[in-house]
């Protein structure tokens, strides 16, 4: 693998991680692909401090994060444990709502306009945030 010692151009360093904030929208899977090709992953929020940092950079815009339940239970893309980890859902969320008329429920998590999380249809073209850790050898990403 290769190690990153500083963040690439256009990425923002914070607490030994690098963050990249999109300016356009993609479906969740396409955003996930994009981050992987940057040898990164969709952002994994592990603390209130990190939540505030990301929220400050994205503003009041729906933005994908690296959390989904497409295979059943909610999972973070980097393997961080969901059950014991940080959460910031909106009240009554996630609700796997089927009433949108797009088929299926809601399997992908995003930041809403106030920063709190909601589950939504994974095909919606939202902005996204990539994250990669500094001083960590690149590894094969976990399979979804």
């Amino acid at each position: 693998g290769s190690e990153r010692t500083c963040c690439p151009v256009n990425w923002v360093e914070h607490e030994r991680s690098c963050y990249w904030f999109s300016r356009s929208g993609k479906a969740w899977a396409d955003a996930d692909n994009y981050c992987r090709l940057e040898d990164a992953h969709l952002v994994v929020v592990t603390s209130w401090e990190e939540q505030k940092f990301v929220q400050h950079h994205i503003g009041p815009v729906n933005t994908w994060m690296g959390l989904h339940d497409q295979n059943g239970p909610w999972k973070w893309v980097d393997g961080t444990d969901y059950e014991t980890g940080f959460k910031n859902w909106r009240p009554e969320q996630p609700d796997d709502w089927y009433g949108h008329g797009l088929g299926g429920g809601e399997d992908c998590a995003h930041f809403t306009d106030d920063g709190r999380w909601n589950d939504d249809v994974c095909q919606r073209p939202y902005r996204w945030v990539c994250e990669t850790e500094l001083d960590k050898a690149s590894q094969e990403p976990p399979l979804l």
Epitope: N10, S24, D30, S138, P141
Partner: antibody, heavy 121, light 107 residues
Framework: QVQLVESGGGVVQPGRSLRLSCAAS????????MHWVRQAPGKGLEWVAV????????YYADSVKGRFTISRDNSKNTLYLQLNSLRAEDMAVYYC??????????????WGHGTTVTVSS | DIQMTQSPSSLSASVGDRVTITCQAS??????LNWYQQKPGKAPKLLIY???TLETGVPSRFSGSGSGTDFTFTISSLQPEDIATYFC?????????FGQGTRLEIK
Amino acid sequence: QVQLVESGGGVVQPGRSLRLSCAASGFTFSNYGMHWVRQAPGKGLEWVAVISYSGNNKYYADSVKGRFTISRDNSKNTLYLQLNSLRAEDMAVYYCARRSSSWGGYGMDVWGHGTTVTVSS
Amino acid sequence: DIQMTQSPSSLSASVGDRVTITCQASQDISDYLNWYQQKPGKAPKLLIYDASTLETGVPSRFSGSGSGTDFTFTISSLQPEDIATYFCQQYDNLPITFGQGTRLEIK
């Protein structure tokens, strides 16, 4: 100056294999994702595969998935494309191209001159 | 996959003419569009990226515009050395896809 030079093309029988190389110079190879694109005789351009800067993450066109493998050796500043189970429709000029640092896309900014693969019995 | 429909497939123009090529994407690609020039036996050369940004060293007679699904490439005053095939390319999503190309010749 930035340069990409492909090699390894040639005439090969259907079902056989070939390995293409792309030697990079004039830029920090290990900082860039890389693509392979091909162009059949008298036809348009077709994207084949892309690889991340470390080589850990790769994506392929459906037409080559399971038969072609993209890889790289950053210590040698070289990109590879392993072509297996070759078919007549794989006959083309194969170009390597550098992935541009565009904000959020997969564009290509620098291309090699190409190497020709001919599939014939 | 995102389909890129480029037109016309060929065109003939005189030196000094204004030449316009269009490219339409089958879905919104924001401004993730490149325009390339390819001369016979040569590799494609990037002219315009992000739909409208001129690549360094490319003459200012070349320009691009558009966003979303509809894009235009223009040569403001055709020169003899501009004889080539021009391709559009979307790079918003994988697989990357190209237009069919426009062959430009001098009248």
